[in-house]
Amino acid sequence: LPAQVAFTPYAPEPGSTCRLREYYDQTAQMCCSKCSPGQHAKVFCTKTSDTVCDSCEDSTYTQLWNWVPECLSCGSRCSSDQVETQACTREQNRICTCRPGWYCALSKQEGCRLCAPLRKCRPGFGVARPGTETSDVVCKPCAPGTFSNTTSSTDICRPHQICNVVAIPGNASMDAVCTSTSPTRSMAPGAVHLPQPVSTRSQHTQPTPEPSTAPSTSFLLPMGPSPPAEGSTGD
């Protein structure tokens, strides 16, 4: 004969556990129903009555089958340097991610705790490794024969144009100036962007251009190269 199906609440057999989507209530000493995502336990079960579930209120949620007395509060609204990539619903928490031009400097279980602006490489420096959602830009000094005359989080060092006759030699922050009307070979006039991320770890110590990364400092006057602002918290 098939085993009899037990309906909640029921007393489990000694040594056995409750079934999926059930929990053992210590007070009632019975297996009772869990509440579905988006709900919480309004009334706990007894020996004779099962769990009574109720929907989560606005701005609260439960993501899992549960028997919590209150739903969890959704996180606070996303800060100005963040965008809401997942709204707060009865079944899921709000998720905030950093807006374009920023990266997550300190993550949390879901979303980002601290966003910071991507570093802008100053003239003479180009992007060695582009920023990602979770990592800052890495800058490097432009090597001989290359230059960058921009303050940018995307521009790399570009080769100097090659002149028939050089009027002013190029350096790390300035292109060469030709005397003739057109150079022998000139790079595209637009800023060049770094396509792919470079290797994950670098340990340069030679006197060649090197990358690096860091944020803003309130220590300097506003005239300064202004590293990223402190960033903000999105809890």
């Epitope: 601290l114 670098s202 944020p215 220590f219 402190e230």
Partner: antibody, heavy 121, light 107 residues
Framework: EVQLQESGGGLVQPGGSLNLSCAAS????????LSWVRQTPGKRLEWVAY????????YYSDTVKGRFTITRDNAKNTLYLQMSSLKSEDTAMYYC??????????????WGQGTTVTVSS | DILMTQSPASLSLFVGETVTITCRAS??????LAWYQQKQGKSPQLLVY???KLAEGVPSRFSGSESGTQYSLKINSLQSEDFGTYYC?????????FGGGTKLEIK
Amino acid sequence: EVQLQESGGGLVQPGGSLNLSCAASGFAFSTYDLSWVRQTPGKRLEWVAYINNGGISTYYSDTVKGRFTITRDNAKNTLYLQMSSLKSEDTAMYYCVRGPFYGSANYFDYWGQGTTVTVSS
Amino acid sequence: DILMTQSPASLSLFVGETVTITCRASENIYSNLAWYQQKQGKSPQLLVYDATKLAEGVPSRFSGSESGTQYSLKINSLQSEDFGTYYCQHFWVTPWTFGGGTKLEIK
């Protein structure tokens, strides 16, 4: 208030190892690049090592490359310097410094009080 | 490595006098230079960055200038608190070397 507090210095024999730590507070640690700088008994300053804010890029002076390792724990707001195969010329005051925000803001804007490392037999 | 040659190594002056300390880089460092002040038993403190910009809180009697690969720190009307050791440092390619220091003593 920005604070950098070094610890872990001491007396060690040549060839030995030492681990320095720097506890940081008062700023968004995970967004700043950090370095170690040392000052010899003769008062010369020498940049030792650098690590970027995410811990991805590290640079070393030739004098310590292969012997020293700079790391950071952004969850603990702590910077580290693991020193091995120590030589007598590594004897110095070691400073934890904030910066440079390399390629963007190139300077050391805050320095710790320093921790003394003495390598001697 | 880029060599930073700082001069003079030391000098002794009266309060109220003006002093200029120089640092010459062995190659172009594109204004990526900082000046620090260190007092006896203390850590260095940032004075000037980008060769000419004063760090916050630094008195206006301090000024930085550059000419080619030569960088200067000028202190007008020396005050008693200005005495100490001054260092320059470049931030072009690694290693980021310091000058040998200039010890400024009170006469």
